[in-house]
């Protein structure tokens, strides 16, 4: 009853000319030990002789005779469990069907294994995850359906020719279930890797190139933007016009929406790649950026700081401290909103210009009663002179003077 024979081995094994093939194999013959083993190449059953015809690569009988010309073929098995085989070197014409003709005392069995030998080393295969997103670690897998103890190989990863060797882990399998060499590369792709070529290179033990596989990376990423402004220094005067342009240098997938932000807040009805600001006012000064979104998320440009320059506004005066006691010190501060900052100040006491006082602050180290009154100022920058504000009142407190009796 031939159903007693149970075999386990890979269905097909792959190799190339000059390499080797290692065939992991187990079997079970319940009626006793193996007495004869013949390894055929492309066996065919001859009905006339009731035997198999074909090239005998290896023969092992009770007498232990082995064809001397087939030293490259080794049966590494035993009489009851192991049927592992090795062919080293393996040749192109070894391709086809290997037939393991097994005979025990009472039973016979022909087990077939497919052998595929190519002329040149075949390429590995790169497997990518279904989606790759920027800055998210992924594992790229390079798989080669080959492994053989007598022919060490290595798989190397390259990004546009630049080695990425340290993050790769190579493993091999030589089991009855599968024969392969696999390299797994842990990789955190950046948006700049999108569209670039990754290579898995098969090399022999001496680092000689054998074959490779290449893939083009499809890295999903938010839109990458550049903002341009006219004028380029983003410094304008009130009433001037400003144009900001948003350019998408990369987006995967395609962008869907565009918006503009000022100081982090979205500008209404500004949904094109150009932002035109006509006759700007000073309250339009601030940090501008464009935001473009795709299915991955929003991308933001760098911020442009728009400075709208204007002449000083009407000034106010702050007094430290009023009322002031005679003999104490007092400081006056002229405050005026302006861009650029005022460079010159004119001070007034009771409407009369104070000579030699051109700074933002006026310091009087020793207050006298006649210092009391209204202080005002005018600020000036390159765009013009501001208006004099209402001023501030200095009250000077002092003890009685020239007391007369009435």
């Amino acid at each position: 009853d031939s159903s007693k024979w149970v075999f386990e081995h890979p269905e097909t094994l792959y190799a190339w000319e000059g390499a080797c093939v290692w065939i992991p194999c187990t079997y079970r013959a319940l009626d006793g030990d193996l007495e004869s083993f013949i390894l055929f190449h492309n066996p065919e059953y001859n009905k006339n002789t009731s035997k198999f015809d074909g090239t005998r690569l290896y023969e092992s009988t009770k007498d232990g005779k082995v064809p001397s010309e087939q030293k490259r073929v080794q049966f590494l098995g035993d009489k009851n469990k192991n049927c592992t085989l090795s062919i080293h070197p393996v040749h192109l014409n070894d391709s086809g069907q290997l037939g393991l003709r097994m005979e025990s005392k009472t039973e016979k069995w022909m087990e077939r294994i497919h052998l595929n030998v190519s002329e040149r080393p075949f390429p590995p295969h790169i497997q990518l995850p279904p989606e790759i997103q920027e800055s998210q670690e992924v594992t790229l897998t390079c798989l080669l359906n080959f492994s053989c103890y007598g022919y060490p190989i290595q798989l190397q990863w390259l990004l546009e020719g630049v080695p990425m060797r340290q993050a790769a882990v190579t493993s091999t399998s030589l089991t009855i279930k599968s024969v392969f060499t696999r390299s797994e590369l842990k990789f955190s792709p950046q948006w700049s890797h999108h569209g670039k070529i990754v290579t898995c290179q098969l090399q022999d033990a001496d680092g000689k190139f054998l074959s490779n596989d290449t893939v083009q990376l499809n890295v999903k990423h938010t839109p990458k933007l550049e903002i341009k402004v006219t004028p380029s220094d983003a410094i304008v005067r009130e009433g001037d016009s400003v144009t900001m342009t948003c350019e998408v240098s990369s987006s995967n997938p395609e962008y869907t929406t565009v918006s503009w932000l000022k100081d982090g807040t979205s500008l209404k009805k500004q949904n094109t790649f150009t932002l035109n600001l006509r006759e700007v006012t000073k309250d339009q000064s601030g940090k501008y950026c464009c935001q473009v979104s795709n299915d991955v998320g929003p991308g933001r440009s760098e911020e442009v700081f728009l400075q709208v320059q204007y002449a000083p506004e009407p000034s106010t005066v702050q007094i430290l401290h009023s009322p002031a006691v005679e003999g104490s010190q007092v400081e006056f501060l002229c405050m005026s909103l302006a861009n650029p900052l005022p460079t010159n100040y004119t001070w007034y006491h009771n409407g009369k210009e104070m000579q030699g006082r051109t700074e933002e602050k006026v310091h009087i180290p020793k207050i006298l009663p006649w210092h009391a009154g209204t202080y005002s100022c005018v600020a000036e920058n390159i765009l013009g002179t501001g208006q004099r504000g209402p001023g501030a009142e200095l009250d000077v407190q002092y003890p009685p003077k020239k007391v007369t009796t009435v």
């Epitope: 546009e160 020719g161 080695p163 340290q166």
Partner: antibody
């Protein structure tokens, strides 16, 4: 046979600029990443810069970032290194090297001296 | 930071066995490294690659007397039956790709002297 021939080394003053070139032959230039490696007067080797096979990526050591620019012309099989704002510490023999998995081929080198 | 440490010099008797050490920074102890040799006034030449498990392969024209091994963060270059022509500088090197930044680091080199 792989051949790499560097040129352009010279004696220059600090702050000046210079461009080195490397002519490659005997292999498919556009298939390989290329690098510049220098050897300082104390005989230490220092990696300077690398450019990927078709030039999309450039990488620099911290000591030259912002001052040096590596570029390539795959039609002419030539590698370049533009060096600006040179310092005395840039004095070295500059080697052009092919980067396979490691530096598998080197030129003979060209000498740069930066001195006032 | 990726660092390779080598002793600056080592002396061996003619015909003896030599073992040179290159030590990786502890957080990079699993990295694959390369050994290069450099004769005076010549470019470096690839000698060998050594992986963390000690597996290695040698470059073209490197005699069988050269072998490699590994232990922890140490990568060893061994020379059996050392010969006068082995007297030169041996430099180890290592590459890394962090995010989108490639770097290559060399050790300081070990000057090997063959006595007798």
């Amino acid at each position: 046979e792989v051949q790499l021939v560097e040129s352009g080394g010279d004696l220059v003053k600090p702050g000046e600029s210079l461009k080195l070139s490397c002519e490659a032959s005997g292999f498919t230039f556009s298939n390989y990443a290329m690098s510049w490696v220098r050897q300082t007067p104390d005989r230490r080797l220092e990696w300077v810069a690398t450019i990927s096979s078709i030039g999309s990526f450039t990488y620099y050591s911290d000591s030259v970032k912002g001052r040096f620019t590596i570029s390539r012309d795959n039609v002419k099989s030539t590698l370049h290194l533009q060096m600006n704002n040179l310092k005395s510490g840039d004095t070295a023999i500059y080697f052009c090297a092919r980067l396979g998995v490691y530096f598998d081929s080197w030129g003979q080198g060209t000498t740069l001296t930066v001195s006032s | 930071q990726l660092v390779l440490t080598q002793s600056s010099s080592a002396s061996f008797s003619l015909g003896a066995s030599a073992k040179l050490t290159c030590t990786l920074s502890s957080q990079h102890s699993t990295y694959t490294i390369e050994w290069y040799q450099q004769q005076p006034h010549k470019p470096p030449k690839f000698v060998m690659e050594i992986k963390k498990d000690g597996s290695h392969y040698t470059g073209d024209g490197i005699p069988d007397r050269f072998s490699g091994s590994s232990s922890g963060a140490d990568r060893y270059l061994s020379i059996s039956n050392i010969q006068p022509e082995d007297e030169t500088i041996y430099i180890c090197g290592v590459s890394d790709m962090i995010k989108d930044q490639f770097v290559y680091v060399f050790g300081g080199g070990t000057k090997v002297t063959v006595l007798g």
